[in-house]
Interface confidence: medium
């Protein structure tokens, strides 16, 4: 049953050439060049993708042809060294190319920038877009795919196919609208939002492969597949691991062709399957293939199995619960998993995998003991705090985010993330908590029942993000600690850090609160970000600051902003009121 | 060692039913996952059915979900499989089989290689 066993084929690159068609074989190839340099000119990767695909034309047509025998990655490789600017634009990356394959290909992976050098995309007039589209309908979409995969070097490859789907159906519906712009830009935006909140799950995915291994990528699957799938067996369960498990690390690891390809199988394979695996899957399987794998990806949870009994009888009652360990340790722990997730989709899927670790923990501490049955009779009961703390923690801030609104909450983590790490820098404090801000509009409209999975799991997508942009340049011993030392407690252990009392207060610099007429051209968003990085900067100064004295100089800050983009001559007001606040705020602050 | 004996099995019309049992001998009865096979002549051993210890939780193969019901009874160390609505294709051998490893039950239900004991089979015939 095993959906990826293939047989061999003389040309890897004829194989997937076939097996994806061509269409999307330039579109993949195009998405893994800007995925690893993600410096180079949108011209220089479609003449590099334009080779690549005329010499897979020439295997399929002849696989014993010279090189076609090749592995992808040393093609793929091979033509990547060819760029005449590698040591001027990337610097020690073109070192990479000394190395053989699998090294270079590795070499390339560490390389790769989750915050590259790249201008904002900023988005034309509606009327330049269409005509664009118009103009040169592949160029422009192509286009989509580079400017998107370079900026995001983990973005999920097949799910971008399906992104850039979308996005050609929006141009191709509202460049014929009476009213463009009213089609096109609320189109724009949800993909826009899709896509980031896209790339930074799977960012997390390829940094539990990546930092934790396969076995904990497969415990975050067994849960979550479980919770979604809970009428499936376990041994259905484990198999749809093993598979994602497959087509997740090849995608993290740059193996677009192959991820894309072993995607698709295992959309079919679930579609042929689904009286085994759930009832919700029928309007998924009836799509097209992009559309499918994104939905069954998306599907909601199958109802749970009626009369599923106590889990007590086989995991804690019965005498052999150490016998069975014994025997396979990880299959063990993978059906308790199973067992836990199918009856807890109102749980989120690291508070479920600290249940597992707990209980893991207590076998292995037990199962040497005299009585084993007598030391984990009551493991269950340690489970209670684990679950309440997660409860109390979305409880309160669901409060505090009603109180407050989205941008005052925001404010509110800014403020105390800024407290628990003032070292980091402003842009990356300010990205995540504006993120962290969001669970509120995200699951606080949820009921009970699905608070937890939606919040906790998001704020580890979101915590990771910190984490990855920390690790390119590391200035904090207690976000290091926090993002390496286990996945599944990261946000607890962010949200039992106190304030770091370390910290020395940064000098206090006129120029970081000096603002200009500029700003009243910004969109209400980008308003909110400067006057969020002004508020991260106060903090860094005063970390002592009162609530109070912070929202004095923020409603100082927010009536001074509005009074100036009011005034005639906007840049006068600007110098001349902005000495006054920040005058007032140091002397509110005591700087 | 856990002997099994099945009992129940004769001749039947389509249509009718039958209720098979498979008693086991041994006091560790209820560790044992159950399982029903059958052999038509000429073909292979296929799976039937299987129920774990507690007897919640149960498989059963495609052709006979709806139509099969497996059940147990660890005071009496007895396996029951009640057949409804038997068709000629349901004639066969059905053997009654006990498996021990906890991991195999979750893994590979549907496997004879998980089971770690046999009994002789009894012979079901339904005429139409």
């Known amino acids: 049953r095993g959906v990826f066993r293939r047989d061999a084929h003389k040309s890897e690159v004829a194989h997937r050439f076939k097996d994806l068609g061509e269409e999307n074989f330039k579109a993949l190839v195009l998405i893994a060049f800007a995925q690893y340099l993600q410096q180079c000119p949108f011209e220089d990767h479609v003449k590099l993708v334009n080779e690549v695909t005329e010499f897979a034309k020439t295997c399929v047509a002849d696989e014993s042809a010279e090189n076609c025998d090749k592995s992808l990655h040393t093609l793929f490789g091979d033509k990547l060294c060819t760029v005449a600017t590698l040591r001027e634009t990337y610097g020690e990356m073109a070192d990479c190319c000394a190395k053989q394959e699998p090294e270079r290909n590795e070499c390339f992976l560490q390389h790769k920038d989750d915050n590259p050098n790249l201008p904002r995309l900023v988005r034309p007039e509606v009327d330049v877009m269409c005509t664009a589209f118009h103009d040169n309908e592949e160029t422009f979409l192509k286009k989509y795919l580079y400017e998107i995969a370079r900026r995001h070097p983990y973005f999920y490859a097949p799910e971008l196919l399906f992104f850039a789907k979308r996005y050609k159906a929006a141009f191709t519906e509202c460049c014929q609208a009476a009213d463009k712009a009213a089609c096109l830009l609320p189109k724009l935006d949800e993909l826009r939002d899709e896509g980031k909140a896209s790339s930074a799950k799977q960012r997390l995915k390829c940094a539990s492969l990546q930092k934790f291994g396969e076995r904990a990528f497969k415990a975050w699957a067994v849960a979550r597949l479980s919770q979604r799938f809970p009428k499936a067996e376990f041994a259905e369960v484990s198999k749809l691991v093993t598979d994602l498990t497959k087509v997740h690390t090849e995608c993290c690891h740059g193996d677009l062709l192959e991820c894309a390809d072993d995607r698709a199988d295992l959309a079919k394979y679930i579609c042929e399957n689904q009286d085994s695996i759930s009832s919700k899957l029928k309007e998924c399987c009836e799509k097209p293939l992009l559309e499918k794998s994104h939905c069954i990806a998306e599907v909601e949870n199958d109802e749970m199995p009626a009369d599923l009994p106590s889990l007590a009888a086989d995991f804690v009652e019965s005498k052999d619960v150490c016998k069975n360990y014994a025997e396979a340790k990880d299959v063990f722990l993978g059906m308790f998993l199973y067992e836990y997730a199918r009856r807890h989709p109102d749980y989120s899927v690291v508070l479920l995998l600290r249940l597992a670790k707990t209980y893991e923990t207590t076998l292995e501490k037990c199962c040497a003991a005299a009585d084993p049955h007598e030391c984990y009779a009551k493991v269950f009961d340690e489970f209670k705090p684990l679950v309440e703390e997660p409860q109390n923690l979305i409880k309160q801030n669901c409060e505090l985010f009603e109180q407050l609104g989205e941008y005052k909450f925001q404010n509110a983590l800014l403020v105390r993330y800024t407290k628990k790490v003032p070292q980091v820098s402003t842009p990356t404090l300010v990205e995540v908590s504006r993120n962290l801000g969001k669970v509120g509009s995200k699951c606080c409209k949820h009921p009970e029942a699905k608070r937890m999975p939606c919040a906790e799991d998001y704020l580890s997508v979101v915590l990771n993000q910190l984490c990855v942009l920390h690790e390119k340049t590391p200035v904090s011993d207690r976000v290091t600690k926090c993002c390496t030392e286990s996945l599944v407690n990261r946000r607890p252990c962010f949200s039992a850090l106190e304030v770091d009392e370390t910290y020395v207060p940064k000098e206090f610099n006129a120029e970081t609160f000096t603002f200009h007429a500029d700003i009243c051209t910004l969109s209400e968003k980008e308003r909110q970000i400067k006057k969020q990085t002004a508020l991260v900067e106060l903090v860094k100064h005063k970390p002592k600051a009162t609530k109070e004295q912070l929202k004095a100089v923020m409603d100082d800050f927010a009536a001074f902003v509005e009074k100036c983009c009011k005034a005639d001559d906007k840049e006068t007001c600007f110098a001349e009121e902005g000495k006054k606040l920040v005058a007032a705020s140091q002397a509110a602050l005591g700087l | 060692e856990v002997q099994l004996v099945e009992s129940g099995g004769g001749l039947v019309h389509a249509g009718g039913s039958l209720r098979l049992s498979c008693a086991a001998s041994?006091?560790?009865?209820?560790?044992?996952?159950m399982g029903w096979f059958r052999q038509a002549p000429g073909k292979e051993r296929e799976f039937v059915a299987a129920?774990?210890?507690?007897?919640?939780?149960?498989y059963y193969s495609d052709s006979v979900k709806g139509q099969f019901t497996i059940s147990r009874d660890n005071a009496k160390n007895t396996v029951y499989l009640q057949m409804n609505s038997l068709k000629p294709e349901d004639t066969a051998v059905y053997y009654c089989?006990?498996?021990?490893?906890?991991?195999?039950?979750?893994?590979?239900?549907?496997?004879?290689?998980?089971?770690?004991?046999w009994g002789q089979g009894t012979q079901v015939t339904v005429s139409s």
């Open positions: 041994g006091p560790t009865f209820s560790n044992y996952f």
């Open positions: 089989a006990a498996g021990g490893t906890f991991s195999n039950w979750y893994t590979r239900p549907r496997s004879g290689d998980s089971y770690d004991h």
């Open positions: 129920v774990k210890w507690s007897g919640y939780h149960t």
